[in-house]
Amino acid sequence: DGPAGSWEQLIQERRSHEVNPAAHLTGANSSLTGSGGPLLWETQLGLAFLRGLSYHDGALVVTKAGYYYIYSKVQLGGVGCPLGLASTITHGLYKRTPRYPEELELLVSQQSPCGRATSSSRVWWDSSFLGGVVHLEAGEEVVVRVLDERLVRLRDGTRSYFGAFMV
Amino acid sequence: DGPAGSWEQLIQERRSHEVNPAAHLTGANSSLTGSGGPLLWETQLGLAFLRGLSYHDGALVVTKAGYYYIYSKVQLGGVGCPLGLASTITHGLYKRTPRYPEELELLVSQQSPCGRATSSSRVWWDSSFLGGVVHLEAGEEVVVRVLDERLVRLRDGTRSYFGAFMV
Amino acid sequence: DGPAGSWEQLIQERRSHEVNPAAHLTGANSSLTGSGGPLLWETQLGLAFLRGLSYHDGALVVTKAGYYYIYSKVQLGGVGCPLGLASTITHGLYKRTPRYPEELELLVSQQSPCGRATSSSRVWWDSSFLGGVVHLEAGEEVVVRVLDERLVRLRDGTRSYFGAFMV
């Protein structure tokens, strides 16, 4: 393409660069549905924001294709554990795409936090962090799931969160 | 704005793009003050650097407003724990802004690492990682705090650190 | 340099910006060699990709100098532990450079995951995440090491991985 085309492209790029897609969603009282669905998130209040990405029913929705660093942290805790010391937490980031009927695992962690509690009355805390670069097409969605979500502790949006930015 | 203005803006952006703000600060012997203040960091030696951000008394200081991915890891460890299994670590990234008198929680983790030491062997290790995107204005500061900081282990700057980059 | 030079530089930057270096490598059956070397990774299948970085024998090889956010997660687990509850995991990112004969520690974590198992027959899971910004020159390499690698659990590339992107 000629200089004019290149110029237009550069102008375009500068403008799009101004809104390099990024988002940070925070945990809220409504995050844990108990329905078997993904965690839900706050998108506007406090530290939460969406810039060049959208949100739908727990999912970050990609509007511009590219490589994204996606991340999530969940705060775990309890007094004892529902399944005792054998309780396992699976915390994962999953992709939904129109091209497949099922969610695709992207980044996953398994932890046994309850070994930290030596009796049913023991208070314990733990945290799980995930982050990595994945390619996402426009229209694809990313969600966070935690099994067993009864062990997730929410408070003020700083301890459990979900975000992404284009790299 | 006309082509000339756009050109200037592009040139400007290219220059600023060369110094996309980023920093990585490392733990040092002086990091733990025991004063109740934030952790202090090495800014120049070894792996530590500042690029488009400045540093003051433990804080990364923002010079250019924008969205930043901020992160911190702390290496935890000990021989037994001051409060036994009930010992809890809180590791957090906090914002200081001229607009509020108090620090604002940005990203926080709580862990009960002392359950990792059992029976006669009292030695344990654990690690806490935090990372997420936040909006920061010029002049605002981010600090790292750990409570109880007696459980933080420093050595060579690779195990406990603090950083940020604009996204 | 004059406008023409600036124009060329901008065009160049736009093109290079299109391939801002990034990579995400995933764990595979062949990752654990037991040879004392670094972990090996899948570079093409599934979620794995290389863009503006290359790969050689477990190492991400830098082709363009700059600051990179590098990261790794490893999934740990077992039934009991080889050294009992005292077992310590060291998970680290290390740099290889032609300028030094030995690897340089970049980011390191130590964990005592086996305290999560309350008896020799107890199944446990844990996870270790590392991420931080480091400066890398062209030709330098980054590898992941885990000691004791017998405690690393591989499955489908989502639980143990290694990546980087220029910031």
């Epitope: - | 460890g77 021989v79 037994g80 724990c81 001051p82 409060l83 036994g84 299994l85 009930a86 029976s119 006669s120 062997s121 009292r122 030695v123 007696r150 282990r153 050595r155 | -």
Partner: antibody, heavy 119, light 111 residues
């Protein structure tokens, strides 16, 4: 100032139990571990175990397991050590020792309680 | 358990002289560059008194003539110039592993 005041001397018969108290003052009671140590005549110091006042969690020296119990009364900032199935070799001075700020040493000690086991 | 062995059993020293007490552990008491070794002084009819913690740190209120050194399995307590009030029994103690164990003690007596 930090003070640990222990209960008075006791004389017990073999097979009996003894309960020694240690009342703390001058610091935040729940912030420090309390250890128990004894010194038998002509012997050195011997660690019996520890209690964490914040939770009541205990760790005992295997040698005393099953015979010793530590308890805490947070309302009075007092810890107790009960030793059962006493034998003559349990004759000793029993001390409580506060865990230091870095918790792996004992920076303040009670005055000691002499327990004599004799038929 | 970790066995602590002190030597000598008895040390006869004149006031003003230097006293060097030794303590050996049956295995290393180090963790992350720190030694989990403490020294106590005990006088007849009194409770023990903490002198040195973590091998070389002087406890608050303890005179500077007391110093500790060593790492791994071998440790030393030094009293640079003995005063009359220093004649007592000295115990080393490890806290890296349960049960905490003490040495059998070194009695420092007047020569």
């Amino acid at each position: 100032q930090v003070q640990l005041v222990q209960s008075g001397a006791e004389v017990k018969k073999p097979g009996a139990s003894v309960k020694v108290s240690c009342k703390a003052s001058g610091y935040t009671f729940i912030d420090h571990i309390m250890n128990w140590v004894r010194k038998a005549p002509g012997q050195g110091l011997e660690w019996i175990g520890r209690i964490y006042p914040v939770s009541g969690e205990t760790n005992y020296n295997q040698k005393f397991m099953g015979r010793v119990t530590f308890t805490v009364d947070r309302s009075t900032s007092t810890v107790y050590m009960e030793l059962s199935s006493l034998r003559s070799e349990d004759t000793a001075v029993y001390y409580c020792g506060r865990g230091s700020y870095y918790w792996n040493a004992m920076d303040y000690w009670g005055q000691g309680t002499l327990v004599t086991v004799s038929s | 358990e970790i066995v602590m062995t002190q030597s000598p059993a008895t040390l006869s020293v004149s006031p003003g002289e230097r006293a060097t007490l030794s303590c050996k552990a049956s295995q290393s008491v180090d963790f992350d560059g720190e030694s989990y070794m403490n020294w106590y002084q005990q006088k007849p009819g009194q409770a023990p008194r903490l002198l040195i913690y973590s091998a070389s740190n002087l406890e608050s209120g303890i005179p500077a003539r007391f110093s500790g050194s060593g790492s791994g399995t071998e440790f030393t307590l030094t009293i640079s110039s003995l005063q009359s009030e220093d004649f007592a029994v000295y115990y080393c103690q490890q806290s890296i592993e349960d049960p905490w164990t003490f040495g059998q003690g070194t009695k420092v007596e007047i020569k």
